[in-house]
Interface confidence: medium
C-alpha cells in the first residue's frame, strides 16, 4: 500500500510527460499556464481593464507567431508598468485594491510566459489602433486556445 502510494506521483508525472511528448513539444506547460492565466484575467472586470492598449492583432497578417507573442508581451509590460500605481486602478476600497494587485500579478506572469514562448529579445510595437485591455486579453485567449487545440490533436 505504502509502496503504491509512493510510486503513484512519479508514475503520473511520467505519463503526463509522455502525453506531452506524443502531442509534440509545442504543447508545453507554458502554453497551459498562459491559458490558465488568461482565464483568470478575463473572469472579472477591475477599474482598469477598460483602459486602452495598442491593438497588435488588428493588422497581424505578415507577423510570425513568435513576433505576435513578443509584441503581446511588450504591450502587457507597457500597461502594467504605467498603471501598476495608477490611483484610479488601485481604487478606493480594499476589494478594488486587491483585485488590481491581482490583475498586475497575473499580467506579469503572462508577460514572463509569453517572452518564454516567443524566444525573442525585443520587437517593435508601432500600431496606431487601440483596444481595451479586456478585449486584447480575450483575443489573446482565442489565439492561445487555437494553438493548444492544434498541438494537442
Amino acid at each position: 500500500m505504502g509502496l503504491t502510494s509512493q510510486l503513484l506521483p512519479p508514475l503520473f508525472f511520467l505519463l503526463a510527460c509522455a502525453g506531452n511528448f506524443v502531442h509534440g513539444h509545442k504543447c508545453d506547460i507554458t502554453l497551459q499556464e498562459i491559458i490558465k492565466t488568461l482565464n483568470s484575467l478575463t473572469e472579472q472586470k477591475t477599474l482598469c481593464t477598460e483602459l486602452t492598449v495598442t491593438d497588435i492583432f488588428a493588422a497581424s497578417k505578415n507577423t510570425t507567431e513568435k513576433e505576435t507573442f513578443c509584441r503581446a508581451a511588450t504591450v502587457l509590460r507597457q500597461f502594467y508598468s504605467h498603471h501598476e500605481k495608477d490611483t484610479r486602478c488601485l481604487g478606493a476600497t480594499a476589494q478594488q485594491f486587491h483585485r488590481h494587485k491581482q490583475l498586475i500579478r497575473f499580467l506579469k506572469r503572462l508577460d514572463r510566459n509569453l517572452w518564454g514562448l516567443a524566444g525573442l529579445n525585443s520587437c517593435p510595437v508601432k500600431e496606431a489602433n487601440q483596444s481595451t485591455l479586456e478585449n486584447f486579453l480575450e483575443r489573446l485567449k482565442t489565439i492561445m486556445r487555437e494553438k493548444y487545440s492544434k498541438c494537442s490533436s
Epitope: T46, E50, L51, T52, V53, Q96, Q130, T132
Partner: nanobody
Framework: EVQLLESGGGLVQPGGSLRLSCAAS????????MGWVRQAPGKGLEWVSW????????YYADSVKGRFTISRDNSKNTLYLQMNSLRAEDTAVYYC?????????WGQGTLVTVSS
C-alpha cells in the same frame, strides 16, 4: 476623432452643488471607462473620479469621497459628475477624460469656482 465636451461649471458658494456633464463622440462610449480630472490654480492634475463602462465600479479620490458622485448614461454618450458640499479647495478646471493607452485624452475643461 475623439471629442469630449464638458459643461456645467460656474461660480458657487461653499456648501453649494453643481452637476458637470461631458458629451462624448468619436468612439464607442459604452465600451470605455471614463473619468474626471481636475487642475487647481498653480497645481498639477488630480484624478477625481473614474467609472467603468457598465457603471458598476467607481473610484473616488479621498478628497471628494462622500461628496461627489460619478455616473454615466451610455444611451446618451454622456458622463456626469454631481458635486455636493463644495469647498474652496474644489476650485479648479474640471476635465472629462478617456484613457488612451499610456496617455489620457481629455476635453477643454469647465471651470468650477467655489467662493463666497
Amino acid at each position: 476623432e475623439v471629442q469630449l465636451l464638458e459643461s456645467g461649471g460656474g461660480l458657487v458658494q461653499p456648501g453649494g452643488s453643481l452637476r458637470l456633464s461631458c458629451a462624448a463622440s468619436g468612439f464607442t462610449f459604452r465600451n470605455f471607462g471614463m473619468g474626471w480630472v481636475r487642475q487647481a490654480p498653480g497645481k498639477g492634475l488630480e484624478w477625481v473620479s473614474w467609472i467603468i463602462s457598465s457603471g458598476t465600479e467607481t473610484y473616488y479620490a479621498d478628497s471628494v469621497k462622500g461628496r461627489f458622485t460619478i455616473s454615466r448614461d451610455n444611451s446618451k454618450n454622456t458622463l456626469y459628475l454631481q458635486m455636493n458640499s463644495l469647498r474652496a479647495e474644489d476650485t479648479a478646471v474640471y476635465y472629462c477624460a478617456k484613457s488612451l493607452g499610456r496617455f489620457d485624452y481629455w476635453g477643454q475643461g469647465t471651470l468650477v469656482t467655489v467662493s463666497s
